[in-house]
Amino acid sequence: LSVQQGPNLLQVRQGSQATLVCQVDQATAWERLRVKWTKDGAILCQPYITNGSLSLGVCGPQGRLSWQAPSHLTLQLDPVSLNHSGAYVCWAAVEIPELEEAEGNITRLFVDPDDPTQNRNRIASFPG
């Protein structure tokens, strides 16, 4: 089982959308695949895929999941808020026919405030 995640780095503006993609491949067929997205180590969602369908369509705040055969699992955050910033990891495990698991590399999501002055004020509030 192989998991490839992208992009490595994603910078978006608050209120826009962010798309994280996880490509899951295995040489042989699988009957049920458990997938998981985490943000900063905390689980956002942990659905499974069977018969070509996801058991769950939502994933964390403003997050929507989709599965596109043969191998693409997409997490779409819309609209993006400042607290969406963080490190996202996709994990997958074949549960049937036999257990095999893998995880992707981190996607770092940076959310820029809609009002650039918010960023300046926030930085200014941490004296050096």
């Epitope: 295995q26 040489a27 042989t28 067929a29």
Partner: antibody, heavy 120, light 113 residues
Framework: QVQLQESGPGLVKPSQTLSLTCTVS??????????WNWIRQHPGKKLEWIGY???????SYNPSLKSRVTISRDTSKNQFSLKLSSVTAADTAVYYC????????????WGQGTLVTVSS | DIVMTQTPLSLPVTPGEPASISCRSS????????????LDWYLQKPGQSPQLLIY???YRASGVPDRFSGSGSGTDFTLKISRVEAEDVGVYYC?????????FGQGTRLEIK
């Protein structure tokens, strides 16, 4: 260019252990998502999958041979090996090593094959 | 184990004529999860190792002439050669990788009349 090359004795006595090594060049066997396989072809030309060792070190064997087969690897030499114990004349075959990737699942690269004869 | 059955076992063909090989599996090789058929075709030319022709039932491998085509889904698959050439002689194998143990058909020997 990926190349695989089988090596080992061409003649093995009945009841002994057949040992073959596959040396991989042009590609690291530790690269994620790859299966390193052994396949044999009997004199009648029938192809039989023996088993593989995956990137993680996990192995999978053909149930018809499982009790007699061990596939291992030496990452420092970029090699993987086959051991088949208690051989009989029915194990006489051309033995191939081949790779397979999670992205695809087909045997992309094959060695040239080595004939192993089991005879006293 | 999934049993792969090929027909015919021997196929004499006149150069320039079409050829067709059938492969049937004992269970479906189609996955509803990936929308793929886990079936590949190989050609083993005399004195050589097998080489990939078709993957996932219908996709031609890199460098394979377009006279080769694969079709079918589920349990019934076909390899077609639109116009046979002398260099196409050898043994053709179908192979499933839906599950382990990976299994091959018994082979179809194509020869020139």
């Amino acid at each position: 260019q990926v190349q695989l090359q089988e090596s080992g004795p061409g003649l093995v006595k009945p009841s002994q252990t057949l040992s073959l090594t596959c040396t991989v060049s042009g590609f690291s066997i530790t690269t994620g998502g790859y299966y390193w396989n052994w396949i044999r072809q009997h004199p009648g030309k029938k192809l039989e999958w023996i088993g593989y060792i995956y990137t993680s070190g996990r192995t999978s064997y053909n149930p018809s041979l499982k009790s007699r087969v061990t596939i291992s690897r030496d990452t420092s030499k970029n090699q993987f090996s086959l051991k088949l114990s208690s051989v009989t004349a029915a194990d006489t075959a051309v033995y191939y090593c081949a790779d397979m990737a999670d992205k695809g699942g087909w045997f992309a690269y094959w060695g040239q094959g080595t004939l192993v004869t089991v005879s006293s | 184990d999934i049993v792969m059955t090929q027909t015919p076992l021997s196929l004499p063909v006149t150069p320039g004529e079409p050829a067709s090989i059938s492969c049937r599996s004992s269970q479906s090789l189609f996955s509803s999860n990936t929308k793929r058929n886990y079936l590949d075709w190989y050609l083993q030319k005399p004195g050589q190792s097998p080489q990939l022709l078709i993957y996932h039932a219908s996709y031609r491998a890199s460098g394979v002439p377009d006279r080769f085509s694969g079709s079918g889904s589920g349990t019934d698959f076909t390899l077609k050669i639109s116009r046979v050439e002398a260099e196409d002689v050898g043994v053709y194998y179908c192979q499933q990788h839906y599950e382990t143990p990976l299994t091959f058909g018994q082979g179809t020997r194509l020869e020139i009349k």
